[in-house]
């Protein structure tokens, strides 16, 4: 969490941002809140990006003002216009690109004063893994697949029964480049599994950590998946 304060002159106002991550090819949100003002027409929101000459987005007098917007953000940004009055300056970002990563500044002017806060935005690809029993294999085998990751993640297998066991010798992981030549499909196979056990396939890079669990018994198979973004720090 980053909390910024205003500059001298007028009074300063508190602006708060949260570091976040965007999934490339999907839509993202850059979070920013501020001390609200009672009059929408008095609120100016500017989003800036380090190293970019034009603005990322500007909202003033109750509407978007995009004449100074940088070309790389054209048609891709919006604030939640109906929530600005309650202090939400968060930015929607369409079709997140790798090049959108960097340091952003959320700069606010209201009748109470000015304030800003920086936000670190990471970009990559992350997706939920699915673990299945591979019935085509010669021995009891599990197959963990996740369609989109970038940068290349690590894959670690774990089991509830054999806690602390190292499965690297009995697993094989491959990474297949997807058609857009950036993200990769992750496939990891675990051999010699035993029934009445819960296995976890954990995929992690510097942006996200995802886990796919499978419990195999003689009567049923239960699955569960979980994905968690890393380094969400508020400022």
């Amino acid at each position: 969490l980053i909390i910024g304060f205003g500059i001298s002159g007028r009074h300063s106002i508190t602006v708060t941002t949260v570091a976040s991550a965007g999934n490339i090819g999907e839509d993202g949100i850059l979070s920013c809140t501020f001390e609200p003002d009672i009059k929408l027409s008095d609120i100016v929101i500017q989003w800036l990006k380090e190293g970019v000459i034009g603005l990322v987005h500007e909202f003033k007098e109750g509407k978007d003002e995009l004449s100074e917007q940088d070309e790389m953000f054209r048609g891709r940004t919006a604030v939640f216009a109906d929530q600005v009055i309650v202090g939400n300056a968060s930015l929607r970002l369409k079709n997140v690109q790798l090049t959108d990563a960097g340091t952003y500044k959320c700069y606010i002017i209201t009748s109470k004063g000015k304030g800003n806060a920086n936000l670190e935005y990471k970009t990559g690809a992350f997706s939920m893994p699915e673990v299945n029993v591979d019935y085509n294999a010669s021995s009891e085998t599990l197959r963990c697949e996740a369609p989109r990751w970038f940068p290349q993640p690590t894959v670690v297998w774990a089991s509830q029964v054999d806690q602390g066991a190292n499965f690297s010798e009995v697993s094989n992981t491959s990474f297949e480049l997807n058609s857009e030549n950036v993200t990769m499909k992750v496939v990891s196979v675990l051999y010699n599994v035993t029934i009445n056990n819960t296995y976890s396939c954990m995929i992690e890079n510097d942006i996200a950590k995802a886990t796919g669990d499978i419990k195999v018994t003689e009567s049923e198979i239960k699955r569960r998946s979980h994905l968690q973004l890393l380094n969400s720090k508020a400022s």
Epitope: D27, D64, Q69, G75, N95
Partner: antibody
């Protein structure tokens, strides 16, 4: 109520330049993006390009560099120029307003003007 | 560019029935999709944006759903004025592209 009206010649000779103007009434041309879209007879829709009141533009690469879109805020108008036309450019040409900067649907349209390319 | 494919090309449905129109994108467009209705001799009319949000003045019988690559426009209890051509359009990436259209005709 915002209204858009296309104007320009209905017949253009091959290799010449197609020129159309869209006049916006009932609202300011400022604060919105504006687009040209065309529809060959009996076929589907093709986006040509957009302009913002500040003059920033983007065109469909399929039309290569044949397209120029310009704006005149004092007249509340924007214009399309398409050079080196061929019969394949025969279409109904629409001007339209982009709903907002994020949701690029087109919420207001002109009635369309048929431009025929023929000698 | 992102290719939008609509199916079926023609759909025959009786008035009062439900119509389901499909649109598929060649790659994910998230929820950045619009639907239009076009009647002969008229300009298209925006029905849906953001894949599921009805535009101003559009009756509740029109609904949109889907995200990623698969989208559906559903018209329940078809009225006589609903028979027209319907187009989907993606605005996830440049250039903006439209589907080839589905003609909804009276059965």
């Amino acid at each position: 109520q915002v209204q858009l009206q296309e104007s320009g010649p209905g017949l253009v000779k091959p290799s010449e330049t197609l020129s159309l103007t869209c006049t916006v009434s009932g609202g300011s041309i400022s604060s919105y993006y504006w687009s040209w879209i065309r529809q060959p007879p009996g076929k589907g829709l093709e986006w040509i390009g957009y302009i913002y009141y500040s003059g920033s533009t983007n065109n469909n690469p399929s039309l290569k560099s044949r397209v120029t879109i310009s704006v005149d805020t004092s007249k509340n108008q924007f214009s399309l120029k398409l050079i080196s036309v061929t019969a394949a450019d025969t279409a109904v040409y629409y001007c339209a307003r982009v709903y907002n900067n994020y949701d690029w649907g087109f919420d207001y349209w002109g009635q369309g003007t048929l431009v025929t390319v023929s000698s | 560019e992102i290719v939008m494919t609509q199916s079926p090309a023609t759909l025959s449905v009786s008035p009062g029935e439900r119509a389901t129109l499909s649109c598929r994108a060649s790659q994910s467009v998230s929820s950045n999709l619009a639907w239009y209705q076009q009647k002969p001799g008229q300009a298209p009319r925006l029905l849906i944006y953001g894949a599921s949000t009805r535009a101003t003045g559009i009756p509740a019988r029109f609904s949109g759903s889907g995200s990623g690559t698969e989208f559906t426009l559903t018209i329940r209890s078809l009225q006589s004025e609903d028979f027209a051509v319907y187009y989907c359009q993606q605005y996830h990436n440049w250039p903006l592209t439209f589907g080839g259209g589905t003609k909804l005709e009276i059965k």
